[in-house]
């Protein structure tokens, strides 16, 4: 059965997935897709990495952790009820049928009604919408703005709110972790 993760409408969702690369330059391709993991690849791909780069991602999906160390946990920005469902993290280990597949269930709850939003909860400002970005070069005009501005305080605050009391250490024990090499 899938491990369940929760987030509120308008906030950011966090779906953990980890592996341990042999070295920072010897990465394993990973794909994230909406829907349960199929036999091969990912359906409805929202983000993909290869042996070196994050080479594809779509507007609200990005990696919060250091993928060079195998932290390929997915962040979904500014979630809506439509983001509910199963997500597949597939670690594409070379060889026939060697892939590790993790199905994670995301449950989106209606936003809590609060009297007046504080600056820290101004999620539209904190997490502006992004244009769809495909694998691109390193030039500033191509990369600047492709990912939301977010500081560590916000990450920490959001993590506490969004992980439904699940500690970071618990995440690594939740099953979505594999050691490579």
């Amino acid at each position: 059965s899938e491990v369940e993760y929760r987030a509120e409408v308008g906030q950011n969702a966090y779906l953990p997935c980890f592996y341990t690369p042999a070295a920072p330059g010897n990465l394993v391709p990973v794909c994230w897709g909406k829907g349960a993991c199929p036999v091969f690849e990912c359906g409805n791909v929202v983000l993909r990495t290869d042996e070196r780069d994050v080479n594809y991602w779509t507007s609200r999906y990005w990696l919060n952790g250091d993928f060079r160390k195998g932290d390929v946990s997915l962040t979904i920005e500014n979630v809506t009820l439509a983001d509910s469902g199963i997500y597949c993290c597939r670690i594409q280990i070379p060889g026939i049928m060697n892939d590790e597949k993790f199905n994670l269930k995301l449950v989106i709850k209606p936003a809590k009604v609060t009297p007046a939003p504080t600056r820290q909860r101004d999620f539209t400002a904190a997490f502006p919408r992004m244009l769809t970005t495909r694998g691109h070069g390193p030039a500033e005009t191509q990369t600047l703005g492709s990912l939301p501005d977010i500081n560590l305080t916000q990450i920490s605050t959001l993590a506490n709110e969004l992980r439904d009391s699940r500690l970071a250490n618990d995440l690594r024990d939740s099953g979505a972790t594999i050691r490579i090499g």
Partner: antibody
Framework: QVQLQESGPGLVKPSETLSLTCTVS??????????WNWIRQPPGKGLEWIGY???????NYNPSLKSRVTISLDTSKNQFSLKLSSVTAADTAVYYC?????????????WGQGTLVTVSS | EIVLTQSPATLSLSPGERATLSCRAS??????LAWYQQKPGQAPRLLIY???NRATGIPARFSGSGSGTDFTLTISSLEPEDFAVYYC?????????FGQGTKLEIK
């Protein structure tokens, strides 16, 4: 336009610790996907990658320097720092901070102007 | 780690001429090679990434080619501001490494 600026002492005594700071301006410091690197260049020689820190705080160092290097982050000041311990004359170099992005890992698109650090007694 | 060898160490040419700089890797780096330009007292500037892609704002006279172990940076017609030191850098294997540089000087 992203700008990086190194700062720190220009002279360090042998066996002491070299400490440098890179200040980032222009908006990309706290963005996911960006890696913040230190690279050095001994006088008249080529460039050597020292290590990086990701905005989450994750670090990675060149194996040749790993035992002596620490890179840290201060998001409140848009700064990241380098500490290199037990320095010798061989550590005399221009030290650069530079940025790369996870869509083109290890391709350094923005650099600071560099700061010369001399190790001498 | 991968060793990058650049040649020649120094290249003397005149403005308007064509410059061809070479970078050879000790093992294949596929197309994961970048070129940087460095002028005296300045930081390196990214020119070419992934062997043949020009970085933003780089003039069309700069072009890169090659794959595997042999790479070339070509400047089709030298401008006075092109005289500098040029470095290649690979990102195929960790850690990333740089060549020792080619100094392009005015003849």
């Amino acid at each position: 336009q992203v700008q990086l600026q190194e700062s720190g002492p220009g002279l360090v005594k042998p066996s002491e610790t070299l400490s440098l700071t890179c200040t980032v301006s222009g908006g990309s410091f706290s963005r996911g996907g960006y890696y913040w690197n230190w690279i050095r260049q001994p006088p008249g020689k080529g460039l050597e990658w020292i290590g990086y820190i990701y905005y989450s705080g994750s670090t990675n160092y060149n194996p040749s320097l790993k035992s002596r290097v620490t890179i840290s982050l201060d998001t409140s000041k848009n700064q990241f720092s380098l500490k290199l311990s037990s320095v010798t004359a061989a550590d005399t170099a221009v030290y650069y901070c530079a940025r790369d992005h996870y869509s083109s890992s290890w391709t350094f698109d923005y650099w600071g102007q560099g700061t010369l650090v001399t190790v001498s007694s | 780690e991968i060793v990058l060898t650049q040649s020649p160490a120094t290249l003397s040419l005149s403005p308007g001429e064509r410059a061809t700089l070479s970078c050879r890797a000790s093992q294949s780096v596929s197309s994961y090679l970048a070129w940087y330009q460095q002028k005296p007292g300045q930081a390196p500037r990214l020119l070419i990434y992934d062997a043949s892609n020009r970085a933003t704002g780089i003039p069309a006279r700069f072009s890169g080619s090659g794959s595997g172990t042999d790479f070339t940076l070509t400047i089709s017609s030298l401008e006075p501001e092109d005289f500098a030191v040029y470095y290649c850098q690979q990102r195929s294997n960790w850690p990333p490494t740089f060549g020792q540089g080619t100094k392009l000087e005015i003849k």
